[in-house]
């Protein structure tokens, strides 16, 4: 058969952040091309990235149809210029990916502090609600829309003049913390999905500090 120069893909890996989901694999092709198929456990296979020389395939459009489903992908290898060739078993070489459940496994992107406002001894900090590529009624849903109360935020804050950190948590995108009047504070936030077993936490947001050029209010 015509597959003597083809090798099966390996190291199939899901790379996913805020549901933007790409399947990556090796090796870089030499005289071969790849086609990817994706399926839910009970669904039919759908082909994507036909006869590509890339070693990645964006599967976002498929997984956002139902982020709570579990998906499986497979990568087929074909000889370049002879994609009809099959292996000795009568079909092209392929390799299966690990299973992937977007809702449970997509990485949560780095959050961003949208604004902060101080009034006396209270400081209100608002986290920007990042949008995802998940759609409902032709609109893109935010992280909060998708995860609901499964998503919490943790605020780390400290006086600019000291290193002792305090924390607050919230089930929404807002914090309201007690601060000392006349003191400047720095803070950052982290997204957390406590119910998860993997990828439970995002990286910390960039640190914001009061009393800098941006002023007491930032949006």
């Amino acid at each position: 058969s015509g597959t003597t120069n083809t090798v099966a893909a390996y190291n199939l890996t899901w790379k996913s952040t805020n549901f933007k989901t790409i399947l990556e694999w090796e090796p870089k092709p030499v005289n071969q091309v790849y086609t990817v198929q994706i399926s839910t456990k009970s669904g039919d296979w759908k082909s994507k990235c036909f006869y590509t020389t890339d070693t990645e395939c964006d599967l976002t459009d498929e997984i956002v149809k139902d982020v709570k489903q579990t998906y499986l992908a497979r990568v087929f290898s074909y000889p370049a210029g002879n994609v009809e060739s099959t292996g000795s078993a009568g079909e092209p070489l392929y390799e299966n990916s690990p299973e992937f459940t977007p809702y449970l496994e997509t990485n949560i992107g780095q959050p961003v502090i949208q604004k902060y406002e101080q009034g006396g001894t209270k400081l209100k900090v608002t986290v920007k609600d990042s949008f995802t590529l998940v759609r409902r009624n032709n609109t893109f849903l935010s992280l909060r829309d998708v995860f609901g109360k499964d998503l919490i935020y943790t605020l780390y804050y400290w006086k600019s003049s000291s290193s002792g950190k305090k924390t607050a948590k919230t089930n929404t995108n807002e914090f309201l913390i007690d601060v000392d009047k006349g003191e400047n504070y720095c803070f950052s936030v982290q997204a957390v999905i406590p119910s998860r077993t993997v990828n439970r936490k995002s990286t910390d947001s960039p640190v914001e500090c009061m009393g800098q050029e941006k002023g007491e209010f930032r949006e």
């Epitope: 409902r136 849903l141 829309d145 609901g148 948590k169 089930n171 914090f175 309201l176 007690d178 119910s195």
Partner: antibody, heavy 125, light 108 residues
Framework: QVQLQESGPGLVKPSQTLSLTCTVS?????????WSWIRQHPGKGLEWIGE???????RYNPSLKSRVTISVDTSKNQFSLKLSSVTAADTAVYYC??????????????????WGKGTTVTVSS | EIVLTQSPGTLSLSPGERATLSCRAS???????LAWYQQKPGQAPRLLIY???SRATGIPDRFSGSGSGTDFTLTISRLEPEDFAVYYC?????????FGGGTKVEIK
């Protein structure tokens, strides 16, 4: 002032699907709250069934998950409960409730602060 | 599932007396996620306390909540006639949200 009103058949036959609707008045169902269903068996305590956000995000009680569907219709300001394959053990008063964020200790947490009056559902042939 | 055990099952007291209701969790519950409700016959539950110790809007200050970890308490400092009812604790931190079995406060 937000008010909730449950509606649906009071009698359901075994093995059929129980369907209830909660109509929200005096406020928008899309205003950042969650919407829950809770039931209370005759003379017993309260059991949380599940909740939904206006976006359609849901969380269910694992003990009922295989039989429960909660959906939302923002255009009608309603959310609904479907419970399939019912038995006599599903006979209960069913309540809908609003889950609202309350400030506590630097953050905001959701509690069921507005409830419907409840509707009695009997499962019997 | 977090199991909430309330005690006593029934509390028989007279108006003006102090009522102390206990709620014990099978595992630690953050105070942020602990609530108390009051339910009268034929009515829906009414939120009394959230965050273990904060009174909901319109709740008289004779109701107070305390506790942390696995042990929480609802105290009614001086019982009024309208306070005789069933009281439930609830945790909303872990799915499934769970309620205690209730404590009935009845007139002695």
């Amino acid at each position: 002032q937000v008010q909730l009103q449950e509606s649906g058949p009071g009698l359901v036959k075994p093995s059929q699907t129980l369907s209830l609707t909660c109509t929200v008045s005096g406020g928008s169902i899309s205003s950042g709250q969650y919407w829950s269903w809770i039931r209370q068996h005759p003379g017993k305590g309260l059991e949380w069934i599940g909740e939904i956000y206006y976006s359609g995000s849901t969380r269910y009680n694992p003990s009922l998950k295989s039989r429960v569907t909660i959906s939302v219709d923002t255009s009608k300001n309603q959310f609904s409960l479907k419970l399939s394959s019912v038995t006599a053990a599903d006979t209960a008063v069913y309540y809908c409730a609003r889950d609202t964020p309350y400030y506590y200790d630097g953050g905001y947490y959701y509690y069921m602060d507005v409830w419907g009056k409840g509707t009695t559902v009997t499962v019997s042939s | 599932e977090i199991v909430l055990t309330q005690s006593p099952g029934t509390l028989s007291l007279s108006p003006g007396e102090r009522a102390t209701l206990s709620c014990r969790a099978s595992q630690s519950v953050s105070s942020s996620y602990l609530a108390w409700y009051q339910q009268k016959p034929g009515q829906a539950p009414r939120l009394l306390i959230y965050g273990a110790s904060s009174r909901a809007t319109g709740i008289p200050d004779r109701f107070s909540g305390s506790g942390s970890g696995t042990d929480f308490t609802l105290t009614i400092s001086r019982l009024e006639p309208e306070d005789f009812a069933v009281y439930y604790c609830q945790q909303v931190g872990v799915v499934p949200y769970t309620f205690g079995g209730g404590t009935k406060v009845e007139i002695k």
